[in-house]
């Protein structure tokens, strides 16, 4: 028999959590034992399960883990896990701080999309990563020609929306495009919005003619470029 | 014709409670979320409140936080304003301004669009 | 919050002279998309205002090309080439980055 101890110690040592509101925060205490310990948690020292969190919890006995996604002031405290077995228990306390913002217009990750080479046939996937402290809304967007022009007289580009979504803030949104022909070679947008603002990035996909598979025969279908 | 037309304002005692509406017309008002403004007598512009297209979201400043609410009504393409516990200090011209749309933005994304405002005066 | 600081209070100008009205905020307006996202405004007497100026440097449909606006991240400037009677009003820039968004105090223009 063996009292609980901590399996990682060292995914332990940062003990002041200060995230965005909105953020998700995830605490571990992986441990182990003879009996294997239960873990229970605790917020400001009183047993917590979160029926009075919106959004709730969740707890992943077997990753030793606690996470609250889309964390608010009222979420700071103290949080304690606790691990028991019937030999002995350790504890180990995190502090959270609950950083507030100003909501702002959707940021963009830097460099998604990103221009990429693909050759006819293949599939291709476009990312667009979104952080957004109100939810989002997300347009993906081809750039087209139109009598032989890609700009109105208003001096505005025409667009075709390919995708429509709704997504929750920090996911990532993916255009798929199956089957790629030289008529997908162009510019395409992410555009994403939300109550304060919109917010888009644009990228370049390049078709290339199917390859002669006598000297290709090891070359990648897709090829990704910055 | 891209128009916002407010009403409801008035004279109102301090701690009393007022109601504006913006009636928007010649656009997708569903599309589009939607902001309040005001201006107090020979003052600058303040930001008051906005409101998602959907009404998910709104955001307060924190000079009408708790007091204030906005809302919406897509079926009938109507913004609200209801204040509450009004002072003094919210004496000022309302205005009802067009925010961001859900599409490309053929131009700015919003902000680009007022009403004519309406008055409200608190005053005891 | 971020504060928007504008410079002159007050502008008396020539008419078919050129006038400059400066605005400083308290944060980067520079957002990751590239664009700078400062709006500019005119009111004139009785009326709500009316945008001139969106994103930094593009004119809004309808506005004279005697309008331009510039800078970068902090600073930014309203020009007029040349003064006309009808520019008489107040002035305000707006960060429209983040809530609360927040104007400038304004520029009142005015005609020698």
């Known amino acids: 028999q063996q009292a609980p101890y901590w399996t990682h110690p060292q995914r332990m040592e940062k003990k002041l959590h200060a995230v965005p509101a909105g953020n998700t925060v995830k605490f571990r205490c992986p441990a182990a034992g003879n009996p294997t310990p239960t873990i229970r948690w605790l917020k400001d020292g009183q047993a917590f399960h979160g029926e009075n969190r919106i959004g709730g919890i969740r707890l992943r006995h077997q990753h030793w883990s606690l996470v609250m996604e889309s964390v608010v002031p009222s979420d700071r405290g103290t949080y304690t896990c606790l691990v028991e077995n019937a030999v002995g228990s350790i504890r180990y306390n995190y502090l959270l701080d609950v950083l507030e913002r100003s909501p702002h217009r959707p940021i963009l990750q830097a460099g998604l999309p990103a221009n990429t080479t693909a050759v006819v046939g293949s599939d291709v996937e476009l990312l667009c990563k979104v952080y957004s402290d109100a939810q989002p809304h997300i347009q993906w967007l081809k750039h087209i020609v139109i009598n032989g022009s890609s700009f109105g007289a208003d001096g505005f580009p025409y667009v075709q929306v390919l995708k429509t979504a709704d997504i929750n803030s920090s996911e990532v949104e993916v255009l798929y495009l199956r089957n790629v022909s030289a008529e997908d070679a162009g510019e395409y947008t992410c555009l994403a919005g939300n109550s304060i603002g919109l917010s888009y990035q644009s990228a370049w996909l390049t078709v290339l003619p199917e390859e002669d598979p006598t000297w290709t025969a090891a070359a990648p279908e897709a090829r990704y470029t910055d | 014709e891209v128009q916002l037309l407010e009403s409801g304002g008035g004279v109102v005692q301090p701690g009393r409670s007022l109601r504006l509406s913006c009636a928007a017309s010649g656009f997708t008002f569903s599309s589009y979320a939607m902001h309040w403004v005001r201006q107090a007598p020979g003052k600058g512009l303040e930001w008051v409140a906005v409101i998602s297209y959907d009404g998910s979201n709104k955001y307060y400043a924190d000079s009408v936080k708790g007091r204030f609410t906005i809302s919406r009504d897509n079926s009938k393409n109507t913004l609200s304003l209801q204040m509450n516990s009004l002072r003094v200090e919210d004496t000022a011209i309302y205005y009802c301004v067009r925010g961001a749309g859900r599409g490309f933005p053929y131009g700015p994304d919003g902000f680009d669009i007022w009403g004519q405002g309406t008055m409200v005066t608190v005053s005891s | 919050d971020i504060v928007m600081t504008q410079t002159p209070l007050s502008l008396s100008v020539t008419p078919g002279q050129p006038a400059s009205i400066s605005c400083r905020s308290s944060?980067?307006?520079?957002?990751?998309?590239?664009?700078?996202?400062v709006y500019w405004y005119v009111q004139k007497s009785g009326q709500p205002p009316q945008l001139l100026i969106y994103?930094?440097?593009n004119r809004f449909s309808g506005v004279p090309d005697r309008f331009s606006g510039s800078g970068s991240r902090t600073d930014f400037t309203l020009k007029i080439s040349r003064v006309e009677a009808e520019d008489v009003g107040v002035y305000y820039c707006m960060q429209y980055i983040e809530v609360p968004l927040t104007f400038g105090g304004g520029t009142k223009v005015e005609i020698k």
């Open positions: 994103e930094l440097s």
């Open positions: 944060r980067s307006l520079l957002h990751s998309d590239g664009k700078t996202y």
